[in-house]
């Protein structure tokens, strides 16, 4: 039968866990990204924020995975889903928050928001 969407989300969670566990030096040289509201349109917003980090191989797979959860093309400098752009946080903190929230969605069966 149809594959539940949770399998794809599990892959994303595993990648985020991998990033947080393998972090030795400051992630992406301490680059800062816009914080996002972890609500509706979260995946597109997360991608729009992270896409502005370039040259950081550690998060390239995450950026790519997030594109499969967002219906539209996301380019650097695009902020259609980032409703509020008032706080910047380190990429490492961003990834930790994203991991925490995706785990929460996974537990409650809300795979795609």
């Amino acid at each position: 039968g149809p594959v539940p969407p949770s399998t794809a989300l599990r892959e994303l969670i595993e990648e985020l866990v991998n990033i947080t566990q393998n972090q030795k030096a400051p992630l992406c040289n301490g680059s800062m990204v816009w914080s996002i509201n972890l609500t509706a349109g979260m995946y597109c917003a997360a991608l729009e924020s992270l896409i502005n980090v370039s040259g950081c191989s550690a998060i390239e797979k995450t950026q790519r995975m997030l594109s499969g959860f967002c219906p539209h093309k996301v380019s650097a400098g695009q902020f259609s889903s980032l409703h509020v752009r008032d706080t910047k946080i380190e990429v490492a903190h961003f990834i930790t928050k994203l991991l925490s929230y995706t785990k929460q969605l996974f537990r409650h069966g809300q795979q795609f928001n």
Partner: antibody, heavy 123, light 107 residues
Framework: EVQLLESGGGLVQPGGSLRLSCAAS????????MSWVRQAPGKGLEWVSA????????YYADSVKGRFTISRDNSKNTLYLQMNSLRAEDTAVYYC????????????????WGQGTTVTVSS | SYELTQPPSVSVSPGQTASITCSGD??????ACWFQQKPGQSPVLVIY???KRPSGIPERFSGSNSGDTATLTISGTQAMDEADYYC?????????FGTGTKVTVLG
């Protein structure tokens, strides 16, 4: 290591049927969308069909719609392509391809390709 | 149906830059991918998301996409880059491949 191994190709008469299989290994098969892409002798690449990894949606090229059926068995890590009412123009190498994740898998990029299996439709 | 058009062939001298274009209506609104295929081999993804390189793809491969045209650029072209190149995009629930470009490295 991610691997895709196609089988089931061969010579078939016009109007005949064939079922291609693709055995996948080295990744969580059920998570990923999968596609079939073909290449006629001396010609370019042509996408045939895709099966999403989330939600079970299927997609087909107009040239095969109604004749080909894509399916997958996640317990066996295998992708299939049932080809009916075959025509001479279906003669090609058929590649199994690992696609992307999520409901919008097509935003990801076709990462891994099998070696291909040859289908020849001729009388 | 959606179409992606590429030049049939591009010739380049070793060490020079080869540019391959891919044209399609509002292609810049979509993600473009590029594949390299050598004779008798399966295609290999060299660019995804317009300009991103998968791991293992040399830095001399780069891509861009805006308006109606995506471009694959090979800087400092080497003999091993001689191959067929295909662009690809998704439109209306179908993947579309470009017509293909044969890159010949002279000499």
């Amino acid at each position: 290591e991610v691997q895709l191994l196609e089988s089931g190709g061969g010579l078939v008469q016009p109007g005949g049927s064939l079922r291609l299989s693709c055995a996948a290994s080295g990744f969580t098969f059920s998570s990923y969308a999968m596609s079939w892409v073909r290449q006629a002798p001396g010609k370019g690449l042509e996408w045939v069909s895709a099966f999403s990894g989330s939600g079970g949606s299927t997609y087909y090229a107009d040239s095969v719609k109604g004749r080909f059926t894509i399916s997958r068995d996640n317990s066996k890590n295998t992708l299939y392509l049932q080809m009916n009412s075959l025509r001479a123009e279906d003669t090609a190498v058929y590649y199994c391809v690992q696609d992307g994740l999520g409901p919008y898998f097509y935003n990801y990029g076709m990462d891994v390709w099998g070696q291909g299996t040859t289908v020849t439709v001729s009388s | 149906s959606y179409e992606l058009t590429q030049p049939p062939s591009v010739s380049v001298s070793p060490g020079q830059t080869a540019s391959i274009t891919c044209s399609g209506d509002k292609l810049g609104d979509k993600y473009a991918c590029w594949f390299q295929q050598k004779p008798g081999q399966s295609p290999v993804l060299v660019i995804y998301h317009d300009s991103k390189r998968p791991s293992g793809i040399p830095e001399r491969f780069s891509g861009s996409n805006s308006g109606d045209t995506a471009t694959l650029t090979i800087s400092g072209t080497q003999a091993m880059d001689e191959a067929d190149y295909y662009c690809q995009a998704w439109d209306s629930s179908t993947y579309v491949f470009g017509t293909g470009t044969k890159v010949t490295v002279l000499g």
